[in-house]
């Protein structure tokens, strides 16, 4: 299964269009920047097998699309960029179901990283949070749509090492 | 390793163009926002304004608004300053730093080594 | 604009004190708020970010506290390589605004 490989380039077209996907300036957001406290060890231990990274990142990809397919977002971004951005997450999470039933197969170790997938859970209840509080405003999302273009380019690292170890 | 390289120093007249550069290597350059600060001889640091590389988006202050231009070139990882028209009070060091938008990371942790513009008749 | 102002604009110190230098905004900017060192001839140097977490490298008698607009650097022991000149700097609102300075001098 080449998932590393079709994965990144459906994580670059993703990041293409939520860079496009952007309505006011951020300029005027400066003092809505928030600390959401990304994950990063659960995408830098190299102890995961293949099965384990792969449902971290579908995790991080369904929570991703979840928060986009709210009727608040709906509400707030062009709605022709935002069904192709989540056409895209959706491709990418059906790549990665097949890709883990492959693997299944092939490892002994479990399938899911429970604590991984639960820091990630965390990590986007936090971020629902931000929104909520903030009611929703325009500057709200761009501060999240800056964080997840940011926690997107972090997970495309992990999935470079990903492939470097195949 | 992060860095940003500006261009050397310039010599200019009065009522001259100039265009300076700053040019971004060791990190995504359009996942950061460039900004451009000035220091006059013997002065403190005065911010002049910014650029979003990804879309080239600009913010400026208002004391340097129409005085100055700031642009990007994303293909090349640079971004400049330009004047089209240089007074004798353009005279100063000027500084590119990088900034991290609305990523909640540090504010200008890398800067540019500075780019001295004498104008001068 | 938000102005921000130091104090004070100067100071003499020896070697082994402690150092403190304020910065006040003349508005709430909650903790958006960094402290840079520039020596003579150079870019200025990040020491502090979101008024006080200390930037990777800088050693850690350096610290910042304060929010809204009392903010405060402290250098614990001063060393022979901190006499330079600081500057605060609110990252609140555009236009961002830096502080007029404080210049640290061997007593």
């Known amino acids: 299964c080449d998932l590393p490989q079709t994965h990144s380039l459906g994580n670059r077209r993703a990041l293409i269009l939520l860079a496009q996907m952007g309505r006011i300036s951020p300029f005027s957001c400066l003092k809505d920047r928030h600390d959401f406290g990304f994950p990063q060890e659960e995408f830098d231990g190299n102890q995961f097998q293949k099965a384990q990274a792969i449902s971290v990142l579908h995790e991080m990809i369904q929570q991703t699309f979840n928060l986009f397919s709210t009727k608040d977002s709906s509400a707030t971004w062009e709605q022709s960029l935002l069904e192709k951005f989540s056409t895209e997450l959706n491709q990418q999470l059906n790549d990665m179901e097949a890709c883990v039933i492959q693997e299944v197969g092939v490892e002994e170790t479990p399938l899911m990283n429970v604590d991984s997938i639960l820091a990630v859970k965390k990590y986007f209840q936090r971020i629902t949070l931000y929104l909520t509080e903030k009611k929703y405003s325009p500057c709200a999302w761009e501060v999240v749509r800056a964080e997840i273009m940011r926690s997107f380019s972090l997970s495309k690292i992990f999935q470079e090492r990903l492939r470097r170890k195949e | 390793e992060v860095q940003l390289v500006q261009s050397g120093a310039e010599v200019k007249k009065p009522g001259e163009s100039l265009k300076i550069s700053c040019k971004g290597s060791?990190?995504?350059?359009?996942?950061?926002?460039i900004g451009w600060v000035r220091q006059m001889p013997g002065k403190g640091l005065e911010w002049m304004g910014i650029i979003d590389p990804s879309d080239s988006d600009t913010a400026y202050s208002p004391s340097f608004q129409g005085q100055v231009t700031i642009s990007a070139d994303k293909s090349i990882s640079t971004a400049y300053l330009q004047w089209s028209s240089l007074k004798a009070s353009d005279t100063a060091m000027y500084y590119c730093?990088?900034?991290?938008?609305?990523?909640?990371?540090?504010?200008?942790?890398?800067w540019g080594q500075g780019t001295l513009v004498t104008v001068s008749s | 604009d938000i102005q921000m102002t130091q104090s004070p604009s100067s100071l003499s110190a020896s070697v082994g004190d402690r150092v403190t230098i304020t910065c006040r905004a003349s508005?709430?900017?909650?903790?958006?708020l960094n402290w840079y060192q520039q020596k003579p001839g150079k870019a200025p140097k990040l020491l502090i970010y979101f008024a006080s977490s200390l930037q990777s490298g800088v050693p850690s008698r350096f610290s910042g506290s304060g929010s809204g607009t009392d903010f405060t650097l402290t250098i614990s022991s001063l060393q022979p390589e901190d006499f330079a000149t600081y500057y605060c700097q609110q990252s609140h609102t555009l236009p961002l605004t830096f502080g007029q300075g404080t210049k640290v001098e061997i007593k």
């Open positions: 060791g990190y995504s350059f359009t996942s950061y926002w």
């Open positions: 508005q709430s900017i909650d903790d958006f």
């Open positions: 730093a990088r900034h991290p938008g609305l990523n909640w990371a540090p504010d200008f942790d890398y």
